[in-house]
Amino acid sequence: KSSNEATNITPKHNMKAFLDELKAENIKKFLYNFTQIPHLAGTEQNFQLAKQIQSQWKEFGLDSVELAHYDVLLSYPNKTHPNYISIINEDGNEIFNTSLFEPPPPGYENVSDIVPPFSAFSPQGMPEGDLVYVNYARTEDFFKLERDMKINCSGKIVIARYGKVFRGNKVKNAQLAGAKGVILYSDPADYFAPGVKSYPDGWNLPGGGVQRGNILNLNGAGDPLTPGYPANEYAYRRGIAEAVGLPSIPVHPIGYYDAQKLLEKMGGSAPPDSSWRGSLKVPYNVGPGFTGNFSTQKVKMHIHSTNEVTRIYNVIGTLRGAVEPDRYVILGGHRDSWVFGGIDPQSGAAVVHEIVRSFGTLKKEGWRPRRTILFASWDAEEFGLLGSTEWAEENSRLLQERGVAYINADSSIEGNYTLRVDCTPLMYSLVHNLTKELKSPDEGFEGKSLYESWTKKSPSPEFSGMPRISKLGSGNDFEVFFQRLGIASGRARYTKNWETNKFSGYPLYHSVYETYELVEKFYDPMFKYHLTVAQVRGGMVFELANSIVLPFDCRDYAVVLRKYADKIYSISMKHPQEMKTYSVSFDSLFSAVKNFTEIASKFSERLQDFDKSNPIVLRMMNDQLMFLERAFIDPLGLPDRPFYRHVIYAPSSHNKYAGESFPGIYDALFDIESKVDPSKAWGEVKRQIYVAAFTVQAAAETLSEVA
């Protein structure tokens, strides 16, 4: 239960008052307001929306609301020289061209400034050559092609289907394979759920729909020209050749109507197995090149996008804490969209807006939170998490000393089946306790708690009677806070049924069809799922900012550390002979985990018993909880990824969206059997075990009695 004794308020100002103030109708109204025109990062429209949000947050009652601007590298198509892909005949004549843009959704025919589909940060170029179909362009797909099928992608244009992994990883893999261009497409197998109509009559992707997105491999760097430092007025910028994470080959996305035209002519090798076949009426031949009759035809890309340093604007709102104003709980989500942003991000931004309004209402009635709450509307998330990262770089010294928690608030929905939560283990108990107090919005669970419907629909694979909570990966604005700065972080949204809907993300993701109507007609007509997400996100912020003792349970970290240690040990034990030969031992890691478990247990006992009326002791215990996440940060970062500094979690090197545990050890072990120098490779495994063991032990000691 929340505790409000220290905040000079009447009894009615508790969590219930905050939650009761949240209204579905307001979220609906805000979503409509935020989605009528595009709000692409770096555009005047998005600047105007930033100023509107600043003004409204002030009206809602926040103490201060400021714009924080940065000049970062963005990418746009050339307005007079459009991007497209051709099939050319032996004379070089273009016999087929892909669409230049998506057919407009009904009601939006006269909207200007809809950016055509493009892969942000693609270099310019007009490569031509034979096509190779590379499935999802995952690491394992290229292994299959190169090692098993002996197909060489060098000098080829590859075509990959969207899904499974972050598109930037696909491009990186294609580059490493020697490809000279990448075509990304949405296959109906991944973006068209059976039995559902395509937009505007359902939530499926039409054949002309295309997913936009950046193709960077930033590894947490933020603005490619100013890694590690804010892109402010006096910034030193790298030359474009030294910029972080930019792709080196042209890349362009297409829809499945156009993909059909490219794939139907494919010849060469047959697909290796059924997992390489999508749902188009094409053979899914791998290539290289077109079949017999069309063997003289080639594919040509025409990419003319430009990278430009452009001003972006974050909105930062402050609600000052009454007791611990120097402790920050942050709620942040982005504002920029690819087009209308009906789901991504405005379903999240509308929820943040209503949460701010509710907090503001309480504040106007005389209430203040115990700790300071910061609200953020980030810019340029779609271009590589730039707004949040630049702000965190600018404020890193404050954040590492004062940051209690970060709650992310991008899309509130990606389905309407059940809750989905990814967070630090420190927040598991907070999430469990909160969802037990909230009503489920799900049909068939009337009068039941959110915890109950969530657990039933998405059970934990390890613990019966508990819901699944996933690891944090990346691909969203929590990245800099968690992976770089070590601030406890979490995210929550409503999701689809992963059992029955195996498509990737939601079908209309990053397309022009992500409109207000998509949400209002097909996902959440009553906005009850949005309201539930507002209650979860807002409730977490309320509790983190207001409870006397921080609602973190360090024992949950102990449990997962043991699980992760077991998992990485199992992976290593696939090579028993090498472990013996190179004297690889995990004893130090298991010992550190054991110590952590014991110390965490004792700390939790002390937490129950200490004198909470003693402000010094209270602050001391809370600081130990706050700084525990920070203790998992290695200042040197992970190998070749200096901005991923968390030793327990990092985005997977093969899929930015996914979280990997003990990533240093995992990466050292990955594909180790193919390393040319096994002695060196196993030496790195041993070094990574040492780093992990040391870090876990060091973190444990931060929980020991201070004297």
């Epitope: 057919p103 009904p106 395509s198 009559d201 002309g208």
Partner: antibody
């Protein structure tokens, strides 16, 4: 065999109303978007309105939106066009047509029904 | 709204002639274009969709081509039953407008 049969046309005075019907057979009616397309005497084709599979979304030529209403009854395999405040310039053969989605061509056409607006 | 401009508005040709009708869109409609044939007193019939795909049962002497803003319908060898009026129509956005028509008459 696909059949679309329009009815309800005739002579009507300016300012009057008329309700056109279209009876469909030979295909799964609810799998198709339906539309009305008109052709004034000696002139070209002009799209009037469309309705989606279940009738939840309707689309109109802007200039006709306030006067015409398209509807459907999937249980009866029928399409309708309610025309109010008719004007002389609404005189035309009105065709019922079917397409298999919002972004699709008109695959099926009826034989048309003539509406004459005259005093 | 996207306007469709057909040319010529009429043409005279003989049986066996190659006939080409063009259609220009006021905006880029990719290949979201259909061609219809209408004979006097009859309803229109679909000939071509997606700019180049022949509808079921349409003779192979008909062909469509083009993309973006410029489209053509070609009849490789005009037959007596082909004398009719031909319309192009885009289905890129609402409203889905038709061209003004091309009347193919016997020379």
């Amino acid at each position: 065999e696909v059949q679309l049969v329009e009815s309800g046309g005739g002579l009507v005075q300016p300012g009057g109303s008329l309700r056109l019907s279209c009876a469909a057979s030979g295909f799964t009616f609810s799998d198709y978007y339906m539309a009305w397309v008109r052709q004034a005497p000696g002139k070209g084709l002009e799209w009037v309105a469309s309705i989606n599979y279940d009738g939840s979304s309707t689309y109109y030529l802007d200039s006709l939106k306030s006067r015409f209403t398209i509807s459907r009854d999937n249980a009866k395999n029928s399409l309708y066009l309610q025309m109010n405040s008719l004007r002389a310039e609404d005189t035309a053969v009105y065709y019922c047509a079917g397409s298999d989605g919002y972004w699709a061509w008109f695959a099926y056409w009826g034989q048309g029904t003539l509406v004459t607006v005259s005093s | 709204d996207i306007q469709m401009t057909q040319s010529p508005s009429s043409l005279s040709a003989s049986v066996g002639d190659r006939v080409t009708i063009t259609c220009r869109a006021s905006g880029n409609i990719h290949n979201y274009l259909a061609w219809y044939q209408q004979k006097p007193g009859k309803s229109p019939q679909l000939l071509v969709y997606n700019a180049e795909t022949l509808a079921d049962g349409v003779p192979s002497r008909f062909s469509g081509s083009g993309s973006g803003t410029q489209f053509t319908l070609t009849i490789s060898s005009l037959q007596p039953e082909d004398f009719a009026t031909y319309y192009c129509q885009h289905f890129w956005s609402t409203p889905p407008t038709f061209g003004g028509g091309t009347k193919v008459e016997i020379k």
